[in-house]
């Protein structure tokens, strides 16, 4: 009688995470009478997969019925496989034996590789805010995937990206592996509805890339420009002049009118007019009494802009044609900003 | 814990037939093989059949033909039927349960069938 | 068939051994206890040399090629039985036991 052999029939198998993995095992005899035994890997460290002796496996199910007395067919499958199952698994006939069973004969092994889909890329910005011509950077990182190999690109509103620097880790063999990207963009003054998408396409995914996206909005800080006016005079011994920030964005925006550098009335930008970039604009006036004043007014417009410094922009409210009425010293009459825009 | 309750002998002439049923619990029925074991009176141990989970079945040589076994896993029951009984049929029956190399480690308390005429 | 003696008998504490023989390398042997005709067995051994949870570690069985062997390490008078050797033969898909062998605890 020829001696009993081990078949494992696949050197390998390709298995997608979250499948079920069929190992095949036959043996050519029932004897020597001993357990058959799964482990993965080879070796003192081995790791045991399935006992047919004895021991709770929930992972794991035989193919055919081991209670056929008969049964030479000791195929397993793995449900839910993850990255973490990858290896080699080999099928071992053991020889009963007192105290322990001896291993009798072991199949070649069958190498189990695990297809694992990278998780949805995540694009981070930078911390503060920058401004048009400058240049930031976006990361994105994506993790858990499996085979190796895989393909990263950049978009800035659907075009193609080229400064950008990747890297997978771990560089050697691994479960599951990481890539991780750096990409540089230039700003310009358009960018508050622009998008930054990084794409990452892998075997597993089916042709169907991830994406993952960056709104420029959270990243780009776009300084107002300021243009002060005189109106014409709404009535005898009143000029209304009016400050228009144009052009900025986000909306955070506190506007403060000095008069001769002393401050007369400061306002947050409340009700603002979108542009189709997606910048703003708002305007504010002032109401000055010049019968109140005996010297020429300097007004001036200061903007503190998201937090930045502020910036200011001036006019010179010439009031020697009109009468001085003595003893007074207050120069503005307050009023509410004006809620129309002008363009 | 495991139980196994058998039930359905009694008294037959001989050339009749009985059906003996198992009632299993306890442990999953349905994962295991079974087998069904008797003793003579003043004699001792003698097996009889054996069927796996998934229903293969196994006999000794001097009762295949009259006597058949089976089981049904969504009522966790086995069953011995008895064609053709004779005299020398009469015994306790017990069934066990196999272990993964089909030996036994758990038994019921038996049920009497007695031929006689 | 499998043989094994017909009696043994013990004092209390004493350690028995029962042998049975007949098999071969491709049986694997079990041992049963039965207390009175008619009764339900008990299996004591299993696979060997198998212990079933809640029998107690006096009991221990070993086997080699053809002849398994059940020991009962300080023997009591409750282990007083009949107890039957099993085996299952790989070679013939088939279930035998030995004629029995009576403990008499003395």
């Known amino acids: 009688e020829e001696e009993l052999q081990v078949i494992q029939p696949d050197k390998s198998v390709l298995v997608a995470a979250g499948e079920t993995a069929t190992l095949r095992c036959t043996a050519t005899s029932l004897i020597p009478v001993g357990p058959i035994q799964w482990f993965r890997g080879a070796g003192p460290g081995r790791e045991l997969i399935y006992n047919q002796k004895e021991g709770h496996f929930p992972r794991v199910t035989t193919v055919s019925d081991l209670t056929k007395r008969n049964n030479m067919d000791f195929s397993i499958r793995i449900g839910n496989i993850t990255p973490a199952d990858a290896g080699t698994y080999y099928c071992v006939k053991f020889r009963k034996g007192s105290p322990d069973d001896v291993e009798f004969k072991s199949g070649a092994g069958t190498e189990l590789s695990v297809r694992a889909k990278p998780s949805a890329p995540v694009v981070s910005g930078p911390a503060a805010r920058a401004t048009p011509q400058h240049t930031v950077s976006f990361t994105c990182e994506s993790h858990g995937f499996s085979p190796r190999d895989i393909t990263l690109k950049w978009f800035k509103n659907g075009n193609e990206l080229s400064d950008f620097q990747t890297n997978v880790d771990p560089v050697g063999e691994s479960v599951s592996y990481s890539i991780h990207s750096t990409a540089k963009v230039v700003l310009t003054r358009e960018d508050v509805h622009s998008q930054v998408i990084c794409e990452v396409a892998h075997v597993t995914l089916q042709g169907d890339p991830l994406r993952g996206t960056a709104n420029l909005s959270e990243t780009i800080r776009v300084p107002p420009t300021l243009e002060v006016t005189q109106q014409p005079v709404r009535a005898e011994n009143q000029v209304n002049v009016t400050c228009q920030v144009r052009k900025f964005y986000p909306q955070r925006l506190q506007l403060t009118w000095l008069e001769n550098g002393n401050v007369s009335r400061t306002e947050t930008a409340s009700t603002v007019t979108e542009n189709k970039d997606g910048t703003y604009n708002w305007m504010s006036w002032l109401l000055v009494n010049v019968s109140a004043h005996r010297d020429d007014v300097k007004l001036t417009c200061q903007v503190e802009h998201d937090g930045q410094p502020a910036v200011s922009k001036s006019h010179d409210l010439k009031v020697s044609a009109h009468p001085k009425e003595q003893g007074s010293n207050t120069a503005a009459e307050n009023t509410g900003s004006n809620e129309r825009n002008i363009y | 814990d495991v139980q196994l309750v058998e039930s359905g002998g009694g008294v037959v002439r001989p050339g009749e037939s009985l059906r003996l049923s198992c009632a299993a619990s306890?442990?999953?029925?349905?994962?295991?093989?079974m087998s069904w074991v008797r003793q003579a009176p003043g004699k001792g141990l003698e097996w009889v059949a054996g069927?796996?989970?998934?229903?293969?079945?196994y006999y000794s040589g001097s009762m295949k033909g009259r006597f058949t076994i089976s089981r049904d896993n969504s009522k966790n029951t086995l069953y011995l039927q008895m064609n053709s009984l004779t005299a020398e049929d009469t015994a306790v029956y017990y069934c066990?349960?196999?272990?993964?190399?089909?030996?036994?480690?758990?038994w019921g308390l038996g049920t009497l069938v007695t031929v006689s005429s | 068939a499998l043989t094994q003696p017909a009696s043994v008998s013990a004092n209390p504490g004493e350690t028995v051994k029962i042998t049975c023989s007949g098999g071969?390398?491709?049986?694997?042997y079990g041992w049963h206890q039965q207390k009175s005709p008619g009764s339900a067995p008990v299996t004591v051994i299993?696979?060997?040399?198998q212990r079933p949870p809640d029998i107690p570690s006096r009991f221990s069985g070993s086997a080699s090629g053809s002849t398994t062997t059940l020991t009962i390490t300080g023997v009591r008078a409750e282990d007083e039985a009949v107890y039957y050797c099993?085996?299952?033969?790989?070679?013939?898909?088939?279930?035998?036991f030995g004629a029995g062998t009576t403990l008499t605890v003395l």
């Open positions: 066990a349960r196999e272990t993964w190399n089909h030996l036994f480690d758990y």
């Open positions: 306890g442990f999953s029925f349905s994962s295991n093989a």
């Open positions: 069927i796996s989970a998934s229903g293969d079945t």
């Open positions: 071969s390398d491709s049986y694997y």
């Open positions: 299993y696979s060997d040399d």
């Open positions: 099993g085996g299952y033969d790989y070679s013939t898909y088939t279930n035998t």
